[in-house]
């Protein structure tokens, strides 16, 4: 199957790499604008320069293009705990990330929130915290893993999945309850 090409891609494919077809005259191939610039005016004719202008502050283009406007710089989402790793330049968007000892949880492809890495209290670190993944903990005896925290088996109810991990403790609790009855 041939992938479906949009009108713009079809037009560009007629010209050699680094050039695009003039929107009013399909016999002319104009040179694309460098990253950090945008298309102000198409080239007037073959072999003549495209009029490209540098992006204004607060905007960028990260690759060669024939965009009529630069793209607006992204803003890091403070409400998601994001911090600015590097600020926007004319040829690169803002880079947002998380603080030290935090990881990213993605709500969608391009929206993430920063969370603190688990410390594995009452357990040991099985896998260290990474950029996009929390620490993986292994719990000590008498504790079970719930939402990546080691919780005491005394908080394990019979209906929960922790019963297998906490079985000896549950039996002991049940035993002491039984022995207390007359």
């Amino acid at each position: 199957l041939v992938p479906h090409l949009g009108d713009r891609e079809k037009r560009d494919s007629v010209c050699p790499q680094g050039k695009y077809i003039h929107p009013q005259n399909n016999s002319i191939c104009c040179t694309k604008c460098h990253k950090g610039t945008y298309l102000y005016n198409d080239c007037p004719g073959p072999g003549q320069d495209t009029d490209c202008r540098e992006c204004e502050s607060g905007s960028f283009t990260a690759s060669e293009n024939h965009l009529r406007h630069c793209l607006s710089c992204s803003k890091c989402r403070k409400e998601m705990g994001q911090v600015e790793i590097s600020s926007c330049t004319v040829d690169r968007d803002t880079v947002c990330g998380c603080r030290k000892n935090q990881y990213r949880h993605y709500w969608s492809e391009n929206l993430f929130q920063c969370f603190n890495c688990s410390l594995c209290l009452n357990g040991t670190v099985h896998l260290s915290c990474q950029e996009k993944q929390n620490t993986v903990c292994t719990c000590h005896a008498g504790f079970f893993l719930r939402e990546n925290e080691c919780v005491s088996c005394s908080n394990c109810k019979k209906s929960l999945e922790c019963t297998k991990l906490c079985l000896p403790q549950i039996e002991n609790v049940k035993g002491t309850e039984d022995s207390g009855t007359t």
Epitope: H105, W107, S108, E109, N110, L111, Q113, F115, E147, N148
Partner: nanobody
């Protein structure tokens, strides 16, 4: 067909509580992150809260932090929003929404499906 049906809205006095529910069908509920968004009269859409697949990760807008609690029951295909200490400014239509990984969706509204909404009115 994906369906999200909200319920639990109504009229409540300031300081009161409400629990919203969202019954989901037509997709594998436990395989998707979910959220609540709201629209106050004459205002734009506002994120309220998100929850991941299991409840391990949650997000709350600053305006509702400490008052609202999002939860889910994957066995019942239901999303909840417990709203306490309600204020007049919480008056809005509340929508249950399914988060999406579709890159063509704008970051400000990363949902591919949402319900018809339930009206919450906070007034004395």
């Amino acid at each position: 067909e994906v369906q999200l049906l909200e319920s639990g809205g109504g009229l409540v006095q300031p300081g009161g509580s409400l629990r919203l529910s969202c019954a989901a069908s037509g997709f594998t509920f436990g395989g998707y992150q979910m959220g609540w968004v709201r629209q106050a009269p004459g205002k734009g859409l506002e994120w309220v809260s998100f929850i991941d697949f299991t409840g391990a990760h949650t997000y709350y807008a600053d305006s509702v932090k400490g008052r609202f609690t999002i939860s889910r029951d994957n066995s019942k295909n239901t999303l909840y929003l417990q709203m306490n200490s309600l204020r007049a400014e919480d008056t809005a239509v509340y929508y249950c929404a399914k988060l999406s990984d579709d890159l063509t969706l704008p970051e400000r509204f990363p949902f591919d499906y949402w319900g018809q909404g339930t009206l919450v009115t906070v007034s004395s």
